[in-house]
């Protein structure tokens, strides 16, 4: 997260880290005791999932292996549409005040809505600085029409843009798959942006979760 702030401890109990060994690979969001939602471009053969701590690599955090993941069947590695994936944990999470599932959206929030994005991604760009603490940034949803002025045909129908005019605050490497939460519901998953990160008026681009609720529910049901 560029130009963000340290999240209030325990305020993101649904936030998870997908680790490759001990190294951060992507962010993710707990949606059920067995399931984590993340970006399709984060796919690996297997995952070490850290839950219940704002510190990356925290020894006291829950760590659960995951060997199965289900990319949206329409994900395109060329256009990056449908950049969403469900990761099934090998064993259920122990829910607590530090580990909770996020609320999935009942509707799509409108442009101008205030939201918070979080992650352990680099806080500087192009040189990288990875924080140990979970970082947050407050951003507002931007209309497709406005966002298309910047990204033109790169912006797919189910992509959502967020940012603050003239501000550097944004997501970056390592934040992928992490949550954009608006009015206590999951509205976006970090998908992509321009590089170096934090260029004013280049919004962060997210997968618009409200368009995928049915796919999420059906996939979890099918692979119970």
């Amino acid at each position: 997260i560029i130009d963000g702030y340290k999240c209030k401890e325990g305020s993101h109990p649904w936030q998870v880290a997908l680790l490759k060994g001990n190294q951060l690979h992507c962010g993710g969001v707990l949606v059920d005791k067995y399931w984590v939602l993340t970006a399709a471009h984060c796919k690996m053969g297997q995952y070490q999932v850290q839950l219940g701590s704002d510190k990356i690599g925290d020894q006291s955090a829950q760590k659960i292996k995951a060997t199965k993941s289900f990319r949206h069947p329409g994900y395109s590695t060329k256009t990056h549409v449908n950049d969403i994936m469900l990761v099934r944990l090998d064993e259920p999470v122990k829910m607590s005040s530090k580990v909770e599932a996020v609320q999935l959206p009942e509707h799509c929030e409108p442009p101008g809505t205030s939201c918070t994005v979080s992650g352990w991604g680099t806080t500087t760009s192009p040189d990288v600085t990875f924080p140990s603490d979970l970082m947050c940034s407050d951003v507002k949803l931007i209309s497709s029409r406005e966002c298309k002025k910047v990204y033109k045909d790169l912006l797919g129908k189910t992509m959502l843009c967020a940012g603050i005019p003239d501000s550097k605050t944004n997501t970056c490497n390592g934040d992928s798959g992490g949550p954009l939460v608006c009015n206590d519901t999951l509205q976006g998953l970090v998908s992509w942006g321009t590089y170096p990160c934090g260029q004013p008026n280049d919004p962060g681009v997210y997968t618009q979760v409200c368009k995928y609720k049915r796919w999420v529910m059906e996939t979890m049901k099918t692979h119970r």
Partner: antibody
Framework: QLQLQESGPGLVKPSETLSLTCTVS??????????WVWIRQPPGKGLEWIGS???????YYNPSLKSRVTISVDTSKNQFSLKLSSVTAADTAVYYC???????????????????WGQGTTVTVSS | DIQMTQSPSSLSASVGDRVTITCRAS??????LNWYQQKPGKAPKLLIY???SLQSGVPSRFSGSGSGTDFTLTISSLQPEDFATYYC??????????FGGGTKVEIK
């Protein structure tokens, strides 16, 4: 500032393996953010991409050369290398190493532009 | 593979002229198009990335435009040091990364 320097034999015999090394100075090759690229240019011709490698060791090769190419990274020496097997006269070229700077992050991390280049090394394939 | 076609392959121009070089992709590459300048015996140098963004340190007389399949590099007022060969390059997720055939800008 970052500099790249190619090194290796200037003359290789047909059917042998061409081996080149690119030494990176003024920055770390293990940076999460970059690709390391090999490109060649036959005499009087245009540029041809050979292949790239990223920080994690994932490689991307030109399909037309894939069966003969190996690119690897040695982070301890801050170097990356090219091996091209079974060379013929058609492999005679100036070989460049370059840094690929991503144009996006996240799902768009794979798109890049070569922003820093070595000065190139001439390799002639001849008996 | 995506083919990149540059035109013209060569052109003659005078100092102060406005020069336009075009690059056409065989299929849409969005804005993932970069331009390089190469002088004889030297390595290529990045001028423009993402179709229209000027690389740091490159004079503002260079500009790029286009999206999808058709792209343009413009030199607004040609300077003596601009006589060189120019290449476009597309950067896909899927290999191969490909270059155009080059445009040689010569002195009239």
């Amino acid at each position: 500032q970052l500099q790249l320097q190619e090194s290796g034999p200037g003359l290789v015999k047909p059917s042998e393996t061409l081996s080149l090394t690119c030494t990176v100075s003024g920055g770390s090759i293990s940076s999460l953010d970059y690709y390391w690229v090999w490109i060649r240019q036959p005499p009087g011709k245009g540029l041809e991409w050979i292949g790239s490698i990223d920080y994690s060791g994932d490689t991307y090769y030109n399909p037309s050369l894939k069966s003969r190419v190996t690119i690897s990274v040695d982070t301890s020496k801050n170097q990356f290398s090219l091996k091209l097997s079974s060379v013929t006269a058609a492999d005679t070229a100036v070989y460049y190493c370059a840094r690929g700077r991503p144009l996006g992050y996240g799902a768009r991390h794979y798109y890049y532009a070569m922003d820093v280049w070595g000065q190139g090394t001439t390799v002639t394939v001849s008996s | 593979d995506i083919q990149m076609t540059q035109s013209p392959s060569s052109l003659s121009a005078s100092v102060g002229d406005r020069v336009t070089i075009t690059c056409r992709a065989s299929q849409s590459i969005s804005s993932y198009l970069n331009w390089y300048q190469q002088k004889p015996g030297k390595a290529p140098k990045l001028l423009i990335y993402s179709a229209s963004s000027l690389q740091s340190g490159v004079p503002s007389r260079f500009s790029g435009s286009g999206s999808g399949t058709d792209f343009t590099l413009t030199i607004s007022s040609l300077q003596p040091e601009d006589f060189a060969t120019y290449y476009c390059q597309q950067s896909p997720y899927f290999p191969p990364l490909t270059f155009g055939g080059g445009t040689k800008v010569e002195i009239k």
